[in-house]
Interface confidence: low
């Protein structure tokens, strides 16, 4: 196999290193000279040559291979030319000859993947691998071979992607910054609570992988898939030369799905403790996990040991199924939480959902807003509310809704943030109902909305802005 | 942060030899790299003269070879040049550098100019 | 020994001009190519290294390409300190042999 990936090295003398500690060297003779024809000398420079030990193996319709693997490693040194040349003992011939750096013909040893698994994001795979020569993985660069596993088809896509290395830690990058509010004061930024728009599955280019040492992160997979993966390295290129190494014994990982599809939801009332919600599957139990990572901290390889979810007494005792599945868990402020559902079929299959990774100041949800108002003057309305939560007044945003007597659609408003109330200009002598939530969207808390205030009737309806 | 500075007389007379000293400060020269020396005649090119490694090998200019030595004082941290029966022909500014991690001189001295005359 | 060819010799450029320098070894010498830069009076500076890596602190608009036997820099947009010589040098193999240099003079 080593052979065939040397095919490009036109050299009659073929070299390679595994570790760049190591010499392995060959050449074929189509002649079937007798024992101890040739000797392998080497040589650096202002060094006395020396002679390689020779094995030799019969090659089928071709003839003899002659091997070397240099003996001590003391004898391979980097940076420095080598002098190679094979002398014939009894013709007093030098047969072949070549001069070259041991850093320049790596081939590498294919890395052994020894954990493949769900990343800390949806469509995410963190692949941890062991390197043959841990010492020289810093000079390697390696590429990954995957596509979806598909029983059905086994020429399905391939996708072959360069790891580029990173400093920082891939699958620990602060999750979702909440950085869209400069949009309207409400607007709804992409969290762990919202029902985005699921992930399309990727083109051959659109993956992006990371890699921190051993470890490699891939995103923009399709959850809920399954993938086989491979993994081979060669020299930088800078450093160390060399070629592509034979690629890793192949693995398979099914990825864990979209909890966005369960409608998952995460929210804290008092910054300590972390309700989670998604809707019931038919016919299926569920169980939520959970586990805190360190933003900072940036292991070799991550396992996170999930944590169960407190489940929560069901609301409605009966035969029925309830619509949420709900539980509970105490957090911390420091740590990024993950969150794991996993629903178990009928038949014993359990299916894995990965939710978006979130702080917990990211999930405060506020309790519902008293709304208050008088009429000031007639078709004149004050409007006025408390703040849920006053160490948080200049964080939070209002949506005011309002819909007439007997009409199904209703008008939005969005009061500007951090206000405690307004005005509206009412058409006299007509029947409305209002509602207030709010929501946390600053540069510190941010969370779902709260529910909607009950509804409160007014005599008379706005059509005005605020 | 790694330092190096010719030093050595300015003029030699011809058949003499030519003696110069790189002071090494910031890294130790048995430690690790491989330290230069190279030269340049006035107005010309650039000419290796030849190298000792950390580990004290040392490897040549066959242009040279017959008329150099490069030795290392360790405990002042000093890569030596001697250079026999010089010419005229060796009148040049003469650097030290260091051959770092991907072959190249990566640090140099600021060199030190020598004339070869009577 | 190898043997590096370096040309031009000389040239005269202007202030954000394209500048490009090449040079040609005896023998493949892989990507075992460095750029300097020196300026009178001082020792030369590394520019470039293995053929195509940019030297930290160097600024972008040096570049590399080549390898084998035919090398080339590139200065996108020639600056006023960018006025000095350059050599190639190869370190493939013993002796290390540098080019005859190119000076980049105002036009």
């Known amino acids: 196999q080593d052979v065939s990936l040397l095919a490009s090295d036109s050299e009659p003398l073929k070299c390679f290193s595994r570790t760049f500690e190591d010499l392995t060297c060959f050449w074929d003779e189509e002649e079937a000279a007798p024992s101890g024809t040739y000797q392998l000398l080497y040589a650096y420079p202002r060094e006395k040559p020396r002679a390689c030990p020779l094995s030799s193996q019969s090659m089928p319709h071709f003839g003899t291979r002659y091997v070397c693997q240099f003996p001590d490693q003391e004898e391979v040194r980097l940076f420095f030319p080598l002098h190679l040349w094979v002398k014939n003992v009894f013709l007093n011939q030098t047969r072949t000859q070549r001069v070259l750096f041991v850093d320049s013909v790596g081939l590498p040893a294919p890395p052994s993947i020894i954990k493949a698994m769900g990343g800390s994001q949806p469509g995410e795979l963190q692949i941890s691998w062991e390197e043959p020569a841990p010492e020289i993985s810093d000079f390697l660069r390696y590429e990954l071979r995957y596509g979806p596993r598909d029983p059905k088809n086994s020429t399905g896509p391939t996708v072959i992607q360069l790891i580029a290395t990173e400093t920082c830690c891939p699958a620990l990058q602060r999750p979702h910054s909440a950085s869209a509010l400069d949009q309207s004061p409400c607007a709804q930024p992409t969290m762990p609570w919202q029902d985005g728009p699921k992930q399309t599955s990727p083109s051959r280019e659109a993956s992006a992988l990371t890699a921190e040492g051993g470890s490699c992160l891939i995103s923009g997979l399709q959850p809920g898939n399954s993938y086989w993966l491979q993994l081979r390295s060669e020299p930088d290129g800078i450093s160390l030369g060399g070629s592509w190494g034979s690629w890793s014994l192949p693995v398979t990982v099914d990825l864990p799905g979209d909890a966005v599809a369960l409608g998952l939801q995460c929210f804290t009332l008092d910054l300590k403790n972390v309700t989670c919600q998604w809707q019931q599957q038919d016919h299926a139990s569920s169980q939520g996990f959970f586990y805190h990572s360190r933003a900072r901290c940036c292991p070799r390889d991550r396992y996170p040991i999930w944590e169960n979810c407190e489940e929560e007494e069901k609301t409605n005792p009966g035969l029925q199924t309830p619509q949420f599945s709900r539980c509970h868990f105490k957090s911390r402020n420091d740590s990024i939480i993950h969150i794991l559902v996993e629903v178990t079929t009928a038949p014993g299959t359990v299916h894995s959902y990965l939710g978006s990774p979130f702080w917990i100041h990211q999930a405060v949800r506020l309790p519902t807003p008293n709304l208050h108002w008088r009429e000031i003057s007639s078709g004149h309305l004050e409007l006025e509310w408390q703040h849920p939560s006053s160490w948080a007044a200049q964080e939070t945003c209002y949506q005011l809704r309002y819909t007439g007597e007997g009409h199904q659609d209703w008008k939005v408003l969005e009061p500007p943030l951090g206000a405690r109330g307004g005005t509206l200009e009412l058409r006299p002598r007509s029947r409305y109902r209002l509602q207030l939530r709010a929501r946390l969207n600053g540069p510190t808390y941010q969370g779902p909305w709260s529910s909607w205030s009950d509804p409160t009737r007014v005599e008379t309806a706005t059509e005005t802005a605020w | 942060q790694v330092q190096l500075q010719e030093s050595g007389p300015g003029l030699v007379k011809p058949s003499q030899t030519l003696s110069l000293t790189c002071t090494v400060s910031?890294?130790?020269?048995?430690?690790?790299?491989?330290w230069n020396w190279i030269r340049q005649p006035p107005g010309n090119g650039l000419e290796w003269i030849g190298y000792?490694?950390?580990?004290?090998?040392?490897s040549y200019n066959p242009s040279l070879k017959s008329r150099v030595l490069i030795s290392v004082d360790t405990s002042k941290n000093q890569v030596s040049l001697k250079l026999s029966s010089v010419t005229a022909a060796d009148t040049a500014v003469y650097y030290c550098?260091?051959?770092?991690?991907?072959?190249?001189?990566?640090?140099w001295g600021q060199g030190t100019t020598v004339t070869v005359s009577s | 020994d190898v043997v590096m060819t370096q040309s031009p010799s000389s040239l005269s450029a202007s202030v954000g001009d394209r500048v490009t320098i090449t040079c040609m070894a005896s023998e493949d010498i892989y990507i075992r190519l460095a750029w300097y830069q020196q300026k009178p009076g001082n020792a030369p500076k590394l520019l470039i290294y293995a053929a195509t890596s940019l030297e930290t602190g160097v600024p972008s608009r040096f570049s590399g390409s080549g390898s084998g036997t035919d090398f080339t820099l590139t200065i996108s947009s020639l600056q006023p300190e960018d006025f000095a010589t350059y050599y190639c040098q190869q370190y493939w193999s013993s002796p290390w042999t540098f080019g005859g240099g190119t000076k980049v003079e105002i036009k």
């Open positions: 910031g890294y130790s020269i048995t430690s690790d790299y491989t």
């Open positions: 000792i490694t950390y580990s004290g090998s040392t």
């Open positions: 550098a260091r051959l770092g991690r991907r072959y190249t001189m990566d640090y």
